[in-house]
């Protein structure tokens, strides 16, 4: 009742190792680090058998396989190259993620190399199991913005892809007679989110209630250029429409809002983010040169009036955009307290245009960002957004346009986006 | 550190007013809006308003409105809540509280209440 | 205005268990909720802002979880100092709204 020798499997050992095994002896096959017992094609971690009363194993010995990890999980906006050959999926075979460049960067500049572990899973050092994440780049146009723009009242034509973040905003309410349909700008803020003026996103109501529009009545264009070839434009609809919960319809206080899509929408040269401003309540320094681009009205000399009585037409073709200073607060405070009529610039707005005008932003404009260049990450940053002025032409002398502080509202911002400012890298570094 | 510390207990008779304070301490009084909140015994929470003491604004839940009236002392950084017309559904704890950021109204500070015993 | 329920008035546990609290929003809130704790006598203290994100300082066993109407906080390994009241609050719209609260018995 001696049983036959035993050879220990290819990559695999056997314990007790004896030179001899009588009846009821057992002994345990195990495979190297990588590699698994197989047997009658189960994979497991460990075998045993038994020296049989006749002289025989209970079982043949197994065969030792090596670990596979299978094809790696892919990854959203990204790419995934092997860096062994014959694209091994194998136990200590490597991969390498990487996000589409020059739209996704990878969130904490992460190798996004993984390795497959002995227990067959892809392995990252830093993220264990995890896949890394490709965040959208933001604030880097695919064409360089000009360094200086004269003087959309006093712009120019945009070229395709100077302003990738600009949206074009339609609200169009069909419940009501006549159909009430306006339009604003926005700016994209990544593939899903939309960052707007609240007063472009409240229902026209006759009272002072702040009450968002359905999001049934909203359209976001994307990558568009001139508004009467909208085929190029990515158009989406809306999952949800937030309003800064303190916008003040009175005094336009808080003119802050959000649309999130339905879809996120395919970043590309034409379709980029605008990056988020560092938190801070002194908003862009007085001085500093901002560019605004709209389709809203690039005539000087067309009142409210007007473009009431004529709908759109008055509006701009081709996108539009204006090279403007911020103004001192304090000047721009008086300048409108100057003014009949209840004009109120608070810590949450801030100015810009020229004291004897001929550049502004105008009506249809409402919501487009105001971007500023950040030296230090070298990316255009949205520290505005197009909300007011005073009641004479666009345009006119000492008339500032009134833009929304946005560094004042990061916080709600990268809230709502599901980002607390606590939890997520500053888009642009001190 | 950020403090909120409001006035003392009082006892009002039905149809009466009352008016507490809340003095904010340890930050610049004017950045965020101070909020108030009624807390009957033993049960929930109710927002009654807010109050900006940067520029004056206030907003007031309408369950509020005619009820409660907010107001700032900018000098001592302290703001009021006075309640008219009591009747004893008003005896309750009420707080003041201040927002964690400024534009997002979730509340991280609170004053210690102030009890208000409605009864003749 | 929008309405919070705590369907949960009381809810009974052992030191060392896991709790979970709920609170649905009557309309889409997206994420803005928070949790606050009550102790007895005290005023109320924030846990979680943002539906998932906790306050500075509240140990990690407390864990926030949810968005648009269905939110819920979980008390992983529940201590002895955590019997309290919990309130939801939504930040969305005003009139801000609490949930009516929902008590933790230790047994």
């Known amino acids: 009742n001696e049983c036959p020798e035993l050879q220990p499997p290819v990559h695999g050992k056997i314990e007790p190792s004896q030179a001899k095994y009588f009846f009821k002896d057992q002994v345990l096959v195990s495979c190297d680090t990588g590699y698994k017992v197989l047997k009658d094609n189960v994979e497991m971690d460990t075998f045993q058998i038994e020296c049989l009363k006749d002289g025989t194993w209970s079982n043949k010995i197994p065969t030792c396989k090596i670990v596979d990890c299978r094809a790696p999980g892919e990854l959203e906006h990204g790419l995934i190259t092997f860096s062994t050959r014959n694209n091994l999926t194998t136990y200590k075979s490597e991969i390498k993620y990487s996000c589409q460049e020059p739209y996704y960067k990878m969130l904490n500049n992460n190798t996004g190399i993984y390795t497959c572990s002995a227990q067959g899973v892809w392995m990252n050092k830093v993220l264990g199991r995890s896949l890394p994440t490709c965040l959208p780049e933001c604030g880097q146009p695919s064409r360089s913005l000009p360094s200086l723009v004269k003087r959309i009242i006093g712009g120019r034509n945009a070229e395709p892809g100077l302003f990738p973040w600009q949206a074009l905003i339609v609200v169009e309410d069909t419940s009501r007679v006549p159909n009430d349909k306006w339009f604003g700008s926005g700016a994209l803020l990544s593939a899903s989110w939309i960052l707007t003026a609240a007063h472009v996103l409240r229902s026209q109501r006759r009272d002072t209630t702040v009450i968002p529009v359905s999001k049934e009545h909203v359209t976001v264009y994307l990558g568009l250029h001139d508004v009467r070839d909208k085929s190029g434009a990515v158009n989406s609809s809306a999952a949800r429409v937030v309003l800064h919960p303190d916008f003040n319809i009175q005094n336009y206080n808080h003119d802050i809002a959000l649309v999130q899509l339905q879809e996120p929408v395919p970043l590309g040269p034409h379709v980029m983010p605008v990056c988020l401003p560092r938190l801070e309540p002194e908003g862009p320094a007085p001085h500093m040169l901002g560019l605004v681009a709209g389709w809203g009205i690039s005539n000087p000399n067309v009142t409210v009036d007007e473009i009431i009585s004529s709908g759109t037409r008055t509006l701009s073709d081709v996108l539009q955009y204006v090279k403007l200073p911020v103004v001192p607060h304090a000047e721009c405070k008086t300048s409108y307290e100057s003014r009949s009529g209840n004009y109120s610039v608070t810590e949450n707005m801030f100015c810009a245009g020229y004291y004897e005008g001929g550049k502004d932003t105008c009506l249809g404009d409402s919501g487009g960002a105001f971007v500023i260049f950040d030296d230090l990450s070298q990316r255009w940053v949205v520290q505005g957004l197009v909300s007011w002025g005073g009641p004479e032409e666009c345009g006119s002398k000492q008339v500032y346009g009134v833009y929304t502080k946005v560094s004042n509202y990061v916080d709600w911002v990268w809230e709502q986006m599901g980002l607390p400012q606590s939890v997520v890298e500053p888009q642009v570094e001190r | 550190q950020v403090q909120l510390k409001q006035s003392g207990a009082e006892l009002v008779k039905p149809g009466a007013s009352v008016k507490m304070s809340c003095k904010a301490s340890?930050?610049?009084?004017?950045?965020?809006?101070i909020e108030w909140m009624k807390q009957n015994h033993g049960k929930s929470l109710e927002w009654i308003g807010n109050?900006?003491?940067?520029?004056?604004?206030?907003k007031y839940n309408e369950k509020f409105k005619g009820k409660a009236t907010l107001t700032v002392e900018k000098s001592s950084s302290t703001v009021y809540l006075e309640l008219s017309r009591l009747p004893s559904a008003d005896s309750a704890i009420y707080y003041c509280a201040r927002r964690h950021y400024a534009a997002s109204p979730w509340f991280a500070h609170w004053g210690q209440g102030t009890l208000v015993t409605v009864s003749s | 205005d929008i309405v919070m329920t705590q369907s949960q008035k009381f809810m009974s546990t052992s030191v060392g268990d896991r709790v979970n609290v709920t609170c649905k929003a009557s309309q889409n809130v997206g994420p803005t909720v928070a949790w606050y704790q009550q102790k007895p006598g005290q005023s109320p203290k924030a846990l979680i802002y943002?539906?998932?994100y906790r306050y500075s300082g509240v140990p990690d066993r407390f864990t926030g979880s949810g968005s648009g109407t269905d939110f819920t906080l979980t008390i992983s390994n529940v201590h002895s100092e955590d019997l309290a009241e919990y309130f939801c609050q939504q930040y969305n719209s005003y009139p801000f709204t609490f949930g009516s609260g929902t008590k933790l018995e230790i047994k």
């Open positions: 109050f900006h003491p940067y520029n004056g604004d206030s």
């Open positions: 340890g930050y610049t009084f004017t950045t965020y809006p």
């Open positions: 943002s539906a998932s």
